[in-house]
Structure formats: C-alpha cells, structure tokens
C-alpha cells in the first residue's frame, strides 16, 4: 500500500521542516522537577517499541509505522547500557537496582550492590543501596508503585527492597536458614522498609497467611495466602495509617481514588501477576492506565510533589512465552498509561522518563508490505518452501519440529493471541537480550538524558532533577508554581 | 567475572555524577556547520552496536560492555524510523533516499520519490529528489563518498543517483528496454550526475568495458569490466578534472592523499565490494579508516567546507550471511573510522552524524557471564539438551537440520569467523529488521537530533546545519574560524 500523499516529496519535506522547527524550539528547562515519574516497560527493547507502534497505529486503521506512540512524543532520547555487574545480559532485579538506585548489582539480586551474592543471605547487610523513591519520601514527597505484575516482583521491588534473591516473594519462598539469618521476604519489606503511599498491582497471595482463601478464587487453594508466619500484611499496613485503604477490584479502586479521606492506598487485584490486558476482565480488574490515573489522583495532592513508578511488567512475560501478541498488546496498554499520565500532569513540573530494563531476542523482519499485519507472514517462502512470520525469536518455546522439520504457518494461525513465534533454539522461556534500550524523557532536566549512558544514570538524573540525595545542592531554580 | 571496584556503590555513583556533570555542561552550538559527515553503518541496528562494543572492549582486554565505542561518545542521540513508503522493513536504497535526500521512497529505488515504481524506468523522470551532497556541492563545498561496498551500491548511490532499480550497477545490469527509455546505470550516474571530489570503495568492474582485465585479478574473467557500451568511465572521469587521479591500491591511495596537486580522487580497490576487514590484504587494500583519512585530507582543503559520506557497508553483508563475526568486525572498523575522523576534524565546525539505514534480525541473549566471548555459548543447555550461542538470528542461512534435529555447537565452532549463527527460519539471506535505529550526533546543530524521528529528518538536519537548500535562510551564525 502506497499512500498517495507520500508519493509527493513535499509531504516529507514539509513534515521534516516541521520536525526541525520543533527541534529548534526545544528549550532545556532550568527548573527543578517537583514530580518524578518513571515508566518502565519490562523487556521493552527497541524492536518491541517499533512493533507496538505499528500495531497501535493499525488498531486505529492507519498503516502503522507513521503513527506516534505516546513515548515517541517525548523530546529527549538516550540509550541505556543494561548489563549487570556479572552478566552481559541482565535480569529485572539487577537492572531495577541500576535505574532505581543508581548502582549496578548482580543478576537476580535487588537493591544491593554487587558485593552481595545471589542467594547468599549473609551478603545482604551493609550492601543495601537506597532507591530514588526512598529518597523522595525522605524529602517529603508522596510515592507510589504501580505494576501489572505482582507488586513484589523484581522491578517494583527495586524501589523499596533489598534481597539477594528476587524470588523471595513471601516468607514461604525464603529458605529457613535465610529466615534465621534475618533475611526478609519482599512482601514484608514492601510494608516495613518505607512508607509507600500508593501500591497498585498484583500479589495478594504473598500478603496473607497460608489457608486464607482469595476473594476472587475462594475455592482455589493455590491462589490463597502463602505466608508461613501467620501474618496478615495488609492488616498490618492498614494499621500504620489512619487514612489507609485496601482494595482488590476495579470498582473499589475508582471509589478510593476519589475519596479525599484516603491518604494511603493498596490495591492488589490478583493473587499473583495481573492478567494480560487481552485476558483482563474490565469489570473486576483495572487496566494499567486506570491504576496510573488512580495513583496520580492521590499522589498529586501533596504540595511537595511525588515520585511514581509505573511498570508495564508483562511485556516481558509475553516475550518469555514467545507470544508476541501478548507482549505487544501489553506494550500498547503501557503506552496508553503514559498518555493518560501526560494528560494528568504538566511537563512544567514533572520529569517523566520512559525506559526498559532490558530487551528480548525478538525481531521484526522479512520485508512485509506496509500496512500488513505485524503478526502476519513475510512475502514469499523460506528455503524449506514454507511460510514464515515477520516476527521471530532468537530462542524460546516457539521452536517446534514436526516430523523432523520446521512447521508451516498460516496467516490465521500467526494472528492468534496464543500463537508462539518460532525461534532458532528451543528453550522453556525465551531469554532477555543484552542490547541497549531507549530512554525517553520529558519535563524539567529531561535534556540531561542524552547520548549513550549506563543504566544507573537514570536514577541519578531523577535524583538531580528533584534535588534529592546526593544532589540536594542541585542549584536548580524551584519549579514554577511551587507551593513548598 | 565481577570486577572488585564495581562492587562498591561509590564506583557507580561517582561515574554517574561525572556523566551528569558532562550532561549539564552540554551547550547547543548556535553556529552553522562548515563541514558535514554522515557515517552510515549499513544494517547496524542497536543490537549490532552493543555486540560490537563488547567485542571492541574485549579486543582491548576489557570485559566488554563497560567500554566506549567512538560513536558512544557522541553527545546527542535520536531514534530513526526506517520504514519505506511501501514496506515496513526497508532496503538500503529507499533508506538512502530518506537520510541523504530527505524524502522517503519505495523499496529498492534510489534518489526518487515514492511516485517512482521499482523497475519501471518510465516512472523515473520528474520524480528525482536531490541529495544533501548535491546541494553541498552547489554551495561550493567539496564532497566525497567512501564505502567498503562497491561505490555504486545502494547506500552511496543515494548521494548522487536516481534509479528505479538499485541493482543497475552497470549498463549490463539494465534491461535493453530501460536503456532505450533513457535510464542510466548507477556507474554512469556516478561520474555524470554531479562533480564528486572523492570516491573511494569497491566497484571497479562496473567502470570498464567488458573484456577489460582487472589489475588485481587479471586472469579472472568474472572480475573484469562488465560494461556493454564500451565506455571506460574512469577515463571519462579523469578527463573532466585536471587534478583528478585514479588509484586502485592502498599505496597509491596514501600517496595521492598527500599530493597537493590532486584535487579529485577516485580509488576503486576491488572489482565488486571490498573485502571483509578480516580478509583484507593490508598491503593492497586500504581499511575504511584509511580511506576516511585520505578523503578528509583532500576534502578539508576547501575553505568552504565539505560533505562526506562514509559507509561501513559490509556490516550488512555479514548479517545477511548470518556470520556475526564478520558483521561485528566490520562494525569495529567502521567505529575506528569514526574515531579517526574525530581526530582529524573539529566539532566546532563539523557536524558528524552516525546512523544505520536499517537493522537486522540479530539478537544477543542467553544470560552469558560478563567477560565471556560475544561469540560464545550461553550457560546451560537448550530444551533439546544441546548448547546454543548467545548470538542468534530470527531468519537466515544459519538454519540447519542434522538428522532431523538442531545441530549441537561447541565454543570453538561458534568462535570461528566462518560460523553461521542459527536461525528460526531457513533463508538464503538473512533479512533486514524494521525496528528504529539510533542516530548519534556531534557538532554544530547536533542538538537538533533528538527524540523519535522519521529517517528523512537526518538529511534535513544536515541541510539546515550547513544552511543548504531549502534552508539557506537558516539564520545561524557562521562557524568560528570560517574563511569564506
């Protein structure tokens, strides 16, 4: 498909001249940021961004790549080097430590320097590193964590926890020896390490004692409470704050977010991770966009500002399953949340960053025609005279041999939300990829986001922009309209 | 491998604070660019950049990812949307039209708007678009094209040619019907469309009549001249300029570049594409770095400045072969050329851009240990109980079934320069990928390179920075030290 207007050079020349005009008008703001928002697309490498852009465009009846994601509109871009201290290709724990605490750690550890060793409890103490969220709280800001995964998952945990094992969600996951040495599960740290004003996502089961039925799955024992210590962490958290409220469904969330008496809000909408967007029951579970809006309504009441972490956490899960449909629809909802946040905040006083913790071995090739489905087939056949999809994985569970050969695929098969794209190597879970990821920035001090940087730079930019530790002597003018 | 110094949070905090300090010091230059250099890494997607960084670092006995490529030091980064008007995943012809002429075209066409149709000669006339190089020449600057491919290849041809078929290298490649309609081969256009001061790369055979033996391969008929029109285009080109010189080996190139009587230089060092860097005979063929240096020595004599196109063109070829070793060693040489150019020019008066025309379905995953070979194996085994490499392709010629199963691989096999990484789908040639590529910028007006842009933006930034058409009223201060 060739759009007629694009045949005319004037179309491109005019468009570029406009882009140039916008670039010339860009003025670095010399003010401090009152508010900080970091949007984390878990596993959202550049190939995922592009494919999601095309899909989002096509859902709006456009050809695809010419459209804009909300993140595409952010004026500043950098590349972030995601390796962990011990691995070329990192996990979401070590990377969370980097972009949230400003220090690189080791694979599968969270909130700890690289002096800590995976799974070795006794290497925890003394190696804790403090997140920007924690520093924001100490500076009097309100803080929040919003995710589509369980709230105790690696990425959000980087904002509040310190653990040598990212899988220690509840005490039932922590070996007895580690518990005896004083290592706390992540759920416990969620409510005890610091005061978090808004906590929204999944992860109910880690908060309740073993045997507590789940309100949504009362007959499913596997979805009920997992704790061995008998603690009801939700109850403990509610007891800490007079204006605290706990909700577990969408209706309650929307009510709470509009209730001026609510000062602290915890919403846990699934026992584990939240549902994929394509599987979400919108009558019970809020979308990432809705959770983001609810969080912003509460946090923005603080005249000193806020710090908010928003994670599209299941982009990563879709890729691990080699189900690009899931990964890309998650990315679109993540982008929708970015768009809504932009409508609810001002770039005069809010520094917004969008980035990924790492990428995936996910590619988009094969010379498909413009306007063709992102989930479709490449033109022509492969060397084995079979069709192949434009989306493919380097490794993962999509590798199948049928009668000793690669299976054929049809357009209707490849378009199914359940379809697993093929891969070169068979793995139970497709792996992360180690290439640089993009950082998109808008708002005060966003111009500092430039060039190729270590992933740790992200935390430092946020801290500097809001004059948080260690940059309290930041020498930035207070933002316009500050009330503090 | 965990470097001891990296275990200390101070290491990361100090490093980030320094990066922040550098970011704060960045001052957009308000001057015009006297010189323009565009470095084009053909097929150099972000995954290629990262893998090459690790390899370059490891060649210097470092662990890898913590090191810097020359391009990593460029202060400004943007993302470029590479689709062509008719394809989600483009080729090097349509993309060359975008970043060199500022207008998007159709797959496999060059220097033409999208009103032109592939292979249809009669859609050429009236749809030509003019490159920034051409405009620079008209403004009195010297201009040059340097590539490791044949100089008539798609990317360099974007600087000077207009053709509905990128494969029309010499008249022997052009169908008789198209020749009768007046469509010229690219080699003819190279010497007749505009006055190019420096032309360095491969592509000898397209310049000479059929039957002309090649000086380097005199007994190999397939390497000799291909032209049917009996023309010796090198001779014709030499006749146009009193100070013109033609060279075909490294020694002659180095001599000519230092000879003040040489005003125009054509160096064609292979009949077709130049050798891969790992196969290059350094006594006969210059490296990309040496060609770049030679070009800069000549071009920088012009007080009005210059435009230079430098292409690492065989990064792409290595990937098409699914031979990552070739692609990455080509990328390192490309980066070396960028580094050398930086030493020979000043960012006060020279706008340098580094980008790719498109990416490849090339990924780097599998959680390898830091410091392990980029060509090595992932830890653990795949689901088929066999080893697998960290580098893989989505599609390509590395797909092999041995006795109806995926072949095993050893570290020594995977480290071979000839090894083809496995792929999910068997193709004769691995395909391009459609995700956004990076644009790195340094020098006057480099700050305009920001955010997510259409690939066409690159040409417009160059034109604006140097006050070329259509931005002659650019309202920029002349660069410091101008002599014009």
């Amino acid at each position: 498909i060739i759009p007629v207007e694009e045949e005319n050079p004037d179309f491109w020349n005019r468009q570029a001249a406009e882009a140039l005009g916008a670039a010339k008008k860009l003025q670095p703001a010399q003010t401090a940021a009152k508010n900080l928002i970091i949007f984390l697309g878990d596993g959202m490498g550049v190939s995922t961004v592009t494919a999601a852009r095309i899909l989002k465009g096509q859902k709006k009846d456009k050809l695809g790549p010419e459209t804009f994601l909300a993140m595409d509109r952010f004026p500043y871009v950098a590349l972030s080097k995601t390796y962990s201290v011990d691995k070329h290709v990192p996990d979401s724990g070590a990377t969370a430590t980097a972009y949230l605490c400003g220090v690189k750690g080791n694979f599968q550890t969270i909130g700890l320097s690289a002096a800590a060793r995976f799974n070795q409890c006794n290497t925890t103490r003394g190696n804790e590193v403090i997140s920007v969220m924690n520093r924001a709280k100490k500076a009097g800001k309100s803080v929040g964590v919003v995710t589509t995964t369980r709230v105790q998952h690696a990425s959000p945990a980087g904002a509040y926890a310190h653990t040598v094992n990212r899988n220690w969600y509840s005490d039932a996951d922590v070996p007895a020896s580690a518990r005896q040495e004083g290592c706390q599960d992540i759920a416990t740290q969620l409510i005890s390490n610091m005061d978090i004003d808004v906590i929204l996502g999944g992860g109910r089961k880690y908060m309740f004692p073993m045997g507590t039925p789940d309100p949504e799955y009362p007959d499913d024992y596997s979805q009920g409470g997992t704790r061995l210590d008998g603690k009801n962490l939700v109850q403990e958290w509610l007891a800490k704050h007079q204006g605290a409220r706990y909700v577990w469904n969408r209706t309650e969330l929307l009510q709470a977010s509009l209730d001026p008496s609510v000062t602290h809000l915890m919403g846990l909408f699934e026992p584990g991770d939240m549902k994929y967007e394509i599987h979400r029951d919108s009558t019970l579970d809020p979308s990432l966009m809705e959770m983001t809006e609810a969080a912003l309504l509460l946090l923005s009441r603080n005249p000193r500002g806020f710090f908010l972490f928003v994670e599209g956490g299941r982009i990563d899960h879709g890729h691990h399953e080699s189900r690009a449909y899931r990964a890309l629809t998650e990315t679109i909802m993540f982008d929708d949340a970015i768009e809504r946040a932009g409508q609810l905040t001002s770039e005069e006083d809010t520094l917004s960053l969008v980035t990924a913790d790492h990428s995936h071995v996910f590619s988009f090739g094969g010379y498909p025609l413009r306007g063709s489905s992102i989930f479709g087939l490449a033109p022509g056949k492969a060397r084995d005279r079979k069709a192949y999809t434009v989306l493919l994985y380097g490794n993962g569970p999509g590798y199948v041999l049928k009668d000793g050969a690669r299976p054929d695929v049809t357009e209707s098969e490849s378009g199914s939300p359940e379809y697993r794209q093929q891969s070169a190597v068979p793995l139970d879970g497709e792996t992360h990829a180690g290439e640089d990821v993009a950082v998109f920035a808008r708002g005060p001090q966003a111009h500092l986001v430039h060039g190729v940087q270590e992933q740790t730079f992200i935390a430092h930019v946020m801290a500097f922009a809001a004059c948080l530790e260690p940059y309290t002597a930041c020498d930035l003018a207070p933002r316009a309209g500050t009330t503090d | 491998i965990i470097p001891v110094e990296e275990e200390n949070p101070d290491f990361w905090n100090r490093q980030a604070a320094e990066a922040l300090g550098a970011a704060k010091k960045l001052q957009p230059a308000q001057t015009a660019a006297k010189n323009l250099i565009i470095f084009l890494g053909d097929g150099m997607g972000v995954s290629t950049v990262t893998a090459a960084r690790i390899l370059k670092g490891q060649k210097k006995d470092k662990l890898g990812p913590e090191t810097f490529l020359a391009m990593d030091r460029f202060p400004y980064v943007a993302l470029s949307k590479t689709y062509s008007v008719d394809k989600h995943v483009p080729d090097s012809g349509a993309t060359a039209t975008a970043y060199l002429c500022g207008v998007k075209g159709n797959f496999q066409t060059i220097g033409l708007s999208a009103a032109a149709r592939f292979n249809q000669c009669n859609t050429t006339r009236g749809n030509e678009v003019i490159s920034v190089m051409n405009r620079a020449k008209k403004a009195g600057k010297s201009v040059g094209v340097v590539t490791t491919t044949r100089v008539q290849h798609a990317s360099p041809a974007g600087a000077y040619a207009h053709t509905v078929n990128r494969n029309w290298y010499s008249d022997a490649d052009v169908p008789a019907s198209a020749r009768q309609e007046g469509c010229q081969d690219i080699a003819t256009q190279l010497i007749s469309n505009m006055d190019i001061d420096v032309i360095l790369g491969g592509g000898r055979k397209y310049m000479f009549p059929m039957g002309t033996p090649d000086p380097e391969y005199p007994d190999d008929y397939s390497q000799g001249g291909t032209r049917l029109d009996g023309k010796n285009l090198v001779q014709e080109w030499l006749a146009k300029h009193q100070g013109a010189r033609y060279v075909w080996n490294r020694t002659e190139l180095l001599q000519a570049s230092l000879d003040p009587s040489v005003t125009h230089l054509m160096g064609l060092f292979e009949p077709g594409d130049m050798k891969y860097e790992i196969h290059r005979d350094s006594t006969l063929d210059p490296s990309l770095m040496e060609m770049t240096e030679a070009a800069l020595l000549l071009l920088s004599r012009n007080p009005r400045g210059f435009f230079l196109f430098v292409e690492g063109g065989r990064i792409d070829h290595g990937h098409h072969e699914s031979r990552a070793y070739r692609a990455l060693t080509e990328t390192i040489m490309f980066d070396d050329a960028i580094e050398r150019a930086g030493q020979l020019t000043s960012e006060e008066d020279t706008l340098s851009l580094v980008t790719a025309d498109h990416s490849h379905v090339f990924s780097f995953g599998g959680y390898p240990l830091r410091g392990s070979s980029i060509f090595g194996l992932a830890p653990g085994k795949a689901r088929d109980r066999k080893a697998y490499t960290v580098l893989l392709y989505g599609n390509g010629p590395g797909y092999v079934l041995k006795d109806g199963a995926r072949p095993d691989v050893t570290e020594s096999e995977s480290g071979s320069p000839e090894y083809r990484q496995q792929s999910a789908v068997p193709l004769d040639g691995e395909t391009h990928a459609g995700e956004d590529v990076a644009v790195f910028a340094r020098g006057p007006q480099a700050h305009l390179v920001h955010g997510v842009q259409e690939q066409t933006f690159i040409a417009h930034v160059m034109a604006f920075a140097a006050c070329l058409e259509p931005y002659t009223a650019c309202d920029l201060a002349p660069r410091a030290g101008t002599t014009d």
Epitope: E216, Y217, P218, R250, S287 | -
Partner: antibody, heavy 117, light 111 residues
C-alpha cells in the same frame, strides 16, 4: 432502585433491520458490561453478545451473530443492539443484562421480537 | 466453547435433593467464571451462584455450587415447591476475545 429495561421489540418482516435499546435507571453503566441474551419461544437462553461499557467499548459477539448483529454504547445509561437481515429464526424475547465478573446480577424483563411475513 | 448441561429434566419430591451437572468443552475463565441462573416462565433469569460456588445475595443456602475448570455442579438440597423452574449454567471464556455460553437448561419438576 436499579433497573434495566429493553425497548424496540416489534413485529418485522424477514430481511428487515431492527434496533433494540437497553436503558439503565438508578445506576450508570461505567462499572458493568451490558450483555444481550435471547430466548426463542419454549427454548433455552442463547448468548448474543456483550459490550465493554467499562473501558474500551469493545464488543464481543457469538460467532453466529457476527456480521448481522452489532452493539454500541450510546450514553452513560443506554446501549443498543442493531440487528440486520432478520429471519424467522430470530423470533425471540431479547434480554439485556449487566455483568460484573462472573455475575449477571440484573436483567431486564425482555422485549419480544417477532419476524414474520 | 460449549456447555453441556445434564440432565435436561429432573423431578424431585419436596425435601429431596437435585444435582445438575455442567461440563465445559474447555476451561472457563479463571477456572471459576461459571454462574447458575433460575428462570421461571415469563420472567428473566435470576442469579443464584457465581464464581462457581459463591451464593448470590438473598439466595437460600440450600443452593450450592461446586467445581472448577470444566466440571461444575449445582446441588439443590431440601427442595421446595418454589424451586420448580428451569436452571441454566453460564460460562465465560477468553481466547481471541471474550465468549460466553449457556448450558441447554435443566427443568426441575417438584412433586
């Protein structure tokens, strides 16, 4: 008091089109889906489709209904069901119901559609 | 996605027990998006059980739902005359979008 009421049922000829409306009173549709169900005389309940009136506005229809039946939210308290190319087999009482999770808690009394020449 | 309800008709004496089965051709959403409805002639259906086993408000505890995944049961104990009606199961499924299906219905006759 919360209620749903269907309207628009009629006697129509084969091949005709008809639009049914479901009107909510005492509440808005922003936290529920609205689903359509029909029941031919003396037969069981048959799901037609649902409208996500909560967030996306997406519609989901039974495979047999796709193409002939469409639904839309027309206000915060009304949704419509458009039916085309009606045949005698479409003669039934048409119900709308509100859905939260696995609960279809509130149903309208139904409206009768008769297709006959 | 099909829900097979058995039996199609059942009779019981007052005070007796009725068991109705509902089998899904694939797992329902969340393994528990199965609800039961009672319909009397000339009336719309009335919700009895949701989430496979949770009693709707105002419904007597004589009605009990059980099951998970693909197999579900509605048990009416201490049957009363007022329980004479047709009972339907309703399942929700998600694959390529949402899909709902009713069982064929079970007529309960009270003697």
């Amino acid at each position: 008091q919360e209620q749903l009421k269907e309207s628009g049922g009629d006697l129509v000829k084969p091949g005709a089109s008809l639009t049914l409306t479901c009107t909510a009173s005492g509440f808005t549709l922003s936290t529920y889906w609205v689903c359509w169900v029909r029941q031919a005389p003396g037969k069981g309940l048959e799901w037609i489709g649902c409208i996500d009136t909560v967030s996306s506005g997406d519609t989901y229809f039974a495979s047999w209904a796709k193409g002939r039946f469409t639904g839309s939210k027309t206000s915060s308290t009304t949704v419509t069901l458009q039916m085309t190319s009606l045949t005698a087999a479409d003669t039934a009482t048409y119900f709308c119901a509100r859905r939260t999770g696995s609960r279809w808690t509130l149903w309208g009394p139904g409206t009768l559609v008769t297709v006959s020449s | 996605q099909v829900l097979t309800q058995t039996p199609s008709s059942v009779s019981a004496g007052v005070g007796g027990t009725v068991t109705i089965n509902c089998q899904a051709s694939e797992s329902v959403y969340n393994n528990n998006y199965l609800s039961w409805y009672q319909q009397k002639p000339g009336q719309p259906p009335k919700l009895l059980i949701y989430q496979a086993s949770t009693l709707a408000s105002g419904v007597p505890s004589r009605f009990k739902g059980s099951g998970s995944g693909t197999q579900f049961t509605l048990t009416i104990s201490d049957v009363q005359c007022d329980d004479a009606a047709t009972y339907y199961c309703l399942g929700a499924f998600v694959s390529n979008g949402w899909y709902f299906a009713f069982g064929g219905g079970t007529e309960v006759v009270v003697k």
